[in-house]
């Protein structure tokens, strides 16, 4: 079965720049089948734009400006690029790769489509660092004493632009676990974004990660954020227990790590 | 030129109860052009859902039916039992492959459908409410209630800003929410929920501690450490009446 | 309130160069969240941009095709201002030159603060 | 280049008209569009931004609409102090074109 990623998630450009966004192609011989391209403008139907057929033939959509798009394929890295030229605010977009996947009976096909890559247009350039800067939170004792079960928190803040993905791991396992999250917010110029992940009790003591996907990301690589394991030992409770508490009488650990 | 209009711009299910979105086309046969339906979900991914034929996604088979009303020209999906994983945009999409005449293996895509699940009617459930605290930083956690009307009140006297609060669907069909805030003060923030005209405060959940050592990062070296601006640090932490730990990286 | 104060001379001769400097109080010039331009009006041309400086972790500049080859608007940090430099200049820059503040980090929503003008005649 | 063309170059109205001005572009440029009203003598002044989006401190009584290629300029009920040229510029793409200004005067 072919399976499309596009890596980009996102790729800021300035205005008159060329952007080029790349399609990956896997599970199916790219020059045994044709690559096409899609765009979906905000509020707008997502319409086709350009294709290339395993023989390399190039086929645009009417009304598509000469010059604008140019699409190819290199069979080496199974990859297809859509360059867009000299950039408008107008092709501020998500753009989809796709491609005719036969299925197992003979004549049914269906068209199976990347994840898409959103283009950003500015006008200005980014300040040097943009990427997601991360915060965790750990379960408070309370929850894992009286739900037997913890919450990880991970806050992401000051990134540009505002297309993150975050999904969370267990430590020495690729199984995605089911998390929820907030709206992405924008905060002056940049943008905020928090997950989070409740766990039973018997997984506390594994460590488990955010993994953050952004453009921005130093070496272009997922960020990974690590929670440590919680030790859960008995602890007396009293759950009712309203009294004002001295702030003293609670000591706040925090772990600060800087790096370059 | 061929249009597919979808019938609603958005249509809130309930978890449990089917539903069924609809997709006209205007100025052309429907006959003639083969059906799709997508679902864009969050992060936009955009899966296949149904084709005409009878071919369906993985994993949707047993949840969606796909059809077509020759007689009204329009094309519908049944989501059979709604789950919260069906919130998204939804798609339809039409094309002429395989079908005589001009060949066009094109999709000409439909404005969405956004599908928005809301838990299913059920009594009233009071939340849990539980406070965690990095810095400056503090998060309400507000944990399976219903109905999901809510109040959050982080309480300081020296905020610096506060978020939206974010509240979505429990796995157990009820609805949780995050609220976070920046406070000068955050080792004396507490949490005050108002719900179903009650008062939950976070403190009623706090316990007390015996223990000196019951919550401790395991002590692990900056080793193989895939991040980019955060490391594992190597923790050995005296920890005296701890009811929370937070890491800043 | 932010305020733009410009200066410079009025009348330059052809193939020399123009020069003129908007001071800028109630804002920086190394603000990352705004952009600093230049901006012309005459009758024949209507309003036309010449381009920006501006900072974000470094200075930048953008220029239309039209000037390109002959503008230069240069930051000064020390003086909270920033100069326009127009080199060659013939009969057909002769103009009303505005600086002005275009707010925002990223993007652009329009030119929200402007200089008083100045007239700038090109003649021998 | 973006060519923006205004529309009428010159309008006469009295207090209290609502006037509306329309401004196209030579192509789409969704809704990256301003406004600038300008006095004899003064500098522009800007009014409205991404099309529809009020400048603060601007009067209610002027709105911006359209997207795309089409838009107009809309003051509700004139005042005397709104007898001016009225420009739009776009912000799709460089250069920022403007247009050629509608000055608009008293009937």
């Known amino acids: 079965a072919g399976h499309l990623e596009q890596p980009q998630i996102s790729s800021t450009k300035t205005l008159s720049k060329t952007a080029r966004l790349e399609c990956v192609v896997s599970g199916i011989t790219i020059s045994a089948t044709s690559v096409y391209w899609y765009r979906e403008r905000p509020g707008e139907v997502i319409q086709f734009l350009v294709s290339i057929s395993y023989d390399g033939t190039v086929r645009k959509e009417s009304g598509i400006p000469s010059g604008k798009f140019e699409v190819d394929r290199i069979p080496e890295t199974s990859t297809s690029t859509l360059t867009i030229h000299n950039v408008e605010k107008q092709d501020i977009a998500t753009y989809y790769c796709a491609l005719w996947e036969a299925q197992q009976e003979l004549g049914k096909k269906i068209k199976v489509f990347g994840p898409g890559t959103k283009l950003i247009i500015t006008d200005k350039q980014l300040d040097a660092d943009v990427s997601p800067k991360p915060t965790i939170f750990l379960p408070s004792i309370a929850e894992t004493k009286l739900q037997k079960a913890g919450t990880y928190l991970c806050l992401l803040e000051k990134f540009f632009p505002d297309v993150i993905k975050i999904h969370w791991q267990e430590k020495k396992s690729n199984t995605i676990l089911g998390s929820q999250e907030g709206n992405t917010m924008k905060t002056n110029d940049t943008y905020m974004k928090f997950s989070w992940l409740t766990v039973p009790e018997k997984s506390l003591d594994k460590e488990h990660r955010c993994i953050v996907r952004h453009e921005n990301n130093k070496n272009g690589v997922d960020q990974e954020i690590i929670f440590p394991p919680i030790k859960t030992d008995v602890i007396t409770m009293d759950p009712k227990d309203n009294c004002s508490k001295d702030a003293n009488d609670t000591l706040l650990l925090q772990l600060t790590n800087t790096s370059a | 030129a061929i249009e597919l209009v979808p019938e609603h711009q958005t249509v809130p299910v309930s978890i449990g109860v089917p539903a069924t979105l609809r997709c006209s086309m205007k100025g052309e046969a429907i006959g003639n052009y083969y059906i799709n339906w997508y679902r864009k979900t969050q992060g936009n991914t955009m899966t296949f859902i149904y084709r005409e034929k009878d071919i369906y996604g993985p994993g949707f088979k047993d949840n969606f039916q796909g059809d077509i009303d020759i007689a009204k020209n329009l094309a519908v999906l049944k989501i059979l039992a709604p789950s919260e994983r069906d919130e998204g945009s939804y798609y339809c999409a039409c094309d002429t492959l395989g079908m005589g005449g001009e060949y066009t293996d094109k999709l000409i895509f439909g404005k969405g459908t956004r599908v928005t699940v809301e838990p299913r009617s059920q009594p009233h459930t009071k939340p849990s409410v539980f406070v965690m605290k990095n810095g400056t930083n503090v998060a309400c956690l507000v944990k399976e209630f219903y109905p999901k009307d809510i109040r959050i009140n982080l309480v300081s006297s020296k905020k610096i800003t506060e978020f939206d609060p974010a509240i979505v669907i429990s796995p157990s069909g009820k609805y949780n929410a995050v609220k976070l805030g920046k406070y000068e003060d955050s080792n004396s923030v507490t949490c005050s929920v108002q719900h179903d005209n009650k008062t939950v405060h976070s403190t009623d959940f706090e316990v007390k501690t015996d223990s000196t050592d019951h919550v401790k990062p395991k002590e692990t070296e900056n080793t193989k450490q895939p991040s980019k601006s955060c490391h594992k640090p190597k923790a050995i932490v005296h920890t005296e009446k701890v009811n929370m730990m937070s890491l800043t990286v | 309130q932010v305020q733009l104060q410009q200066s410079g001379p009025g009348l330059v001769k052809p193939s020399q160069t123009l020069s003129l400097t908007c001071a800028i109080s109630g804002d920086s010039v190394s603000s990352n969240s705004a952009a600093w331009n230049w901006i012309r009006q005459s009758p024949s041309r209507g309003l036309e941009w010449l381009g920006r400086?501006?900072?974000?972790?470094?200075?930048?500049?953008d220029y239309p095709i039209s000037v390109k080859s002959r503008i230069s608007i240069n930051p000064d940090t020390s003086k909270n201002q920033f100069s326009l430099q127009l080199n060659s200049v013939t009969p057909e820059d002769t103009a009303v030159y505005y600086c002005?503040?275009?707010?925002?980090?990223?993007?652009?929503?329009?030119?929200?603060?402007w200089g008083q003008g100045t007239m700038v005649t090109v003649s021998s | 280049d973006i060519q923006m063309t205004q529309s009428p170059s010159f309008l006469s109205a009295s207090v209290g008209d609502r006037v509306t001005i329309t401004c196209r572009a030579s192509?789409?440029?969704?809704?990256?569009l301003a406004w600038y009203q300008q006095k004899p003598g003064k500098a522009p002044k800007l009014l409205i931004y991404a099309a529809s989006t009020l400048q603060s401190g601007v009067p209610s009584r002027f709105s911006g609409s359209g997207s795309g290629t089409e838009f107009t300029l809309t003051i509700s009920s004139l005042q005397p102090e709104d007898f001016a040229t009225y420009y739009c510029q776009e912000f799709n793409s460089y250069p920022y074109t403007f247009g050629q200004g509608t000055k608009l005067e008293i009937k």
């Open positions: 192509q789409g440029i969704s809704s990256y």
């Open positions: 400086t501006y900072y974000r972790s470094k200075w930048y500049n």
């Open positions: 002005a503040r275009e707010s925002g980090s990223y993007y652009t929503d329009g030119f929200d603060i």
